[in-house]
């Protein structure tokens, strides 16, 4: 959470940004809020990126102005125009790329004053894991798959029954490069599993942490997955 103050004569407004992460190939949001101003035509929003000449996006007089937009953002940015009057200056970013990572500035000018705040934007790839019982294996085993990760994550297994156990000797993890030659598919197999136990497959890099749980009993298989972005907010 970053709060910036701007001073214009005697006037300053509070601008707030949130560190966030973008998933390569998907759409992202760079979050920025400011003190609302009902006079839409008097609001100017400028998004800038450190090291880039030209603007990421500009919104003024109630509409976009892409005249000064840098080429790398062409056709890829939009504000939530209907939410600007209530203080939302967040930016939609289409088809996030690795090169979009960096420090962004959200600059606001309204009839009340002006202000700005910086935002650290991380980019990578992260996806939910899915665990299945691998019936093809010679012994009962579990297969954890997640389709898109970058940078290469670490993978660890845990068990409810054998808490604290190290499963690295009885698991095998591979990383397969996807067709776009950036992200990778993660596959990890855990061998010699026992029934009536809950196993967790944890995948983590510096951007996200994902966990897939599976409970195998005589009568059913229960699954659960969750994904958490790291260092956000």
């Amino acid at each position: 959470l970053i709060i910036g103050f701007g001073i214009s004569g005697k006037h300053f407004i509070t601008v707030t940004t949130f560190t966030s992460a973008g998933n390569i190939g998907e759409d992202g949001t760079l979050s920025c809020t400011f003190e609302p101003d009902i006079k839409l035509n008097g609001i100017v929003i400028q998004w800038l990126k450190e090291g880039i000449k030209g603007l990421v996006h500009e919104f003024k007089e109630g509409k976009d102005d892409l005249s000064q937009q840098h080429e790398m953002f062409r056709g890829r940015t939009a504000v939530f125009a209907d939410q600007v009057v209530v203080g939302n200056a967040s930016l939609r970013l289409k088809n996030v790329q690795l090169t979009d990572a960096g420090t962004y500035t959200c600059y606001i000018r309204t009839s009340k004053g002006k202000g700005n705040a910086n935002l650290e934007y991380k980019t990578g790839a992260f996806s939910m894991p899915e665990i299945n019982v691998d019936y093809n294996a010679s012994s009962e085993s579990l297969r954890c798959e997640a389709p898109r990760w970058f940078p290469q994550p670490t993978v660890a297994w845990a068990s409810q029954v054998d808490q604290g156990a190290n499963f690295s000797e009885v698991s095998n993890t591979s990383f397969e490069l996807n067709s776009e030659n950036v992200t990778m598919k993660v596959v990890s197999v855990l061998y010699n599993v026992t029934i009536n136990n809950t196993y967790s497959c944890m995948i983590e890099n510096d951007i996200a942490k994902a966990t897939g749980d599976i409970k195998v009993t005589d009568s059913e298989v229960k699954r659960r997955s969750q994904l958490q972005l790291l260092n956000s907010g």
Epitope: G25, E26, D27, K63, D64, D65, L66, S67, Q68, Q69, R74, G75, R76, T77, A78, R92, K94, N95, S179, E180
Partner: antibody
Framework: QLQLQESGPGLVKPSETLSLTCTVS??????????WGWIRQPPGKGLEWIGN???????YYNPSLKSRVTISVDTSKNQFSLKLSSVTAADTAVYYC????????????WGQGTMVTVSS | EIVLTQSPGTLSLSPGERATLSCRAS???????LAWYQQKPGQAPRLLIY???SRATGIPDRFSGSGSGTDFTLTISRLEPEDFAVYYC?????????FGGGTKVEIK
């Protein structure tokens, strides 16, 4: 309702420059929400995006044609233009102008197209 | 650039039949940025579907789009005589904008 109309010579000699103009009517070319683009279609073949321009004059070209393409805009006439230099027979095509959403980048209004033949 | 491959090249069907056209991308494309166009002989292409599944203004509901990632489909539920044409998919995720090679839907 918005309409686009291409105009220009139907015959261009090899090595010369192809020049076309698109006139926008029923709306302003200075709209902040759109790019104005050119697309071409060789006889019996598919569509190829050439590039686009914003009303302020900023452009983006297809890398495969970038060295030969210039797109310009004249807001006072509500027109934008295409120039393609050093043409060969491979540039023979129907050339379309179109309106492109600045974020959706979908081509939602097209001109009817104009056939340009490159021949001596 | 993103390469789009359409199949089949030609689809021979009768009026009233169902048409299923495929578009495959060389890399994952967000479903928000896949469009379909219809082109009749001597005419400019016309936008049919945007965002993979949203119909453009004035497009009949017999046209529907679906898909995500690298595989997208245009379906015409019951072919009308005016639907026999060439159909193109287009990716709008990144520049340069690219089109598939087209599928011709012809009368059987």
């Amino acid at each position: 309702q918005l309409q686009l109309q291409e105009s220009g010579p139907g015959l261009v000699k090899p090595s010369e420059t192809l020049s076309l103009t698109c006139t926008v009517s029923g709306g302003s070319i200075s709209s902040s929400s759109y790019y104005w683009g050119w697309i071409r279609q060789p006889p019996g073949k598919g569509l190829e995006w050439i590039g686009n321009i914003y009303y302020s004059g900023s452009t983006y070209y297809n890398p495969s044609l970038k060295s030969r393409v210039t797109i310009s805009v004249d807001t006072s006439k509500n027109q934008f233009s295409l120039k393609l230099s050093s043409v060969t027979a491979a540039d023979t095509a129907v050339y379309y102008c179109a309106r492109e959403g600045s974020y959706t980048t979908v081509l939602n209004v097209w001109g009817q197209g104009t056939m340009v033949t490159v021949s001596s | 650039e993103i390469v789009l491959t359409q199949s089949p090249g030609t689809l021979s069907l009768s009026p009233g039949e169902r048409a299923t056209l495929s578009c495959r991308a060389s890399q994952s494309v967000s479903s928000s940025y896949l469009a379909w166009y219809q082109q009749k002989p001597g005419q400019a292409p016309r936008l049919l579907i945007y965002g993979a599944s949203s119909r453009a203004t004035g497009i009949p509901d017999r046209f529907s789009g679906s898909g995500s990632g690298t595989d997208f489909t245009l379906t015409i539920s019951r072919l009308e005589p005016e639907d026999f044409a060439v159909y193109y998919c287009q990716q709008a995720a990144s520049y340069p904008l690219t089109f598939g090679g087209g599928t011709k839907v012809e009368i059987k």
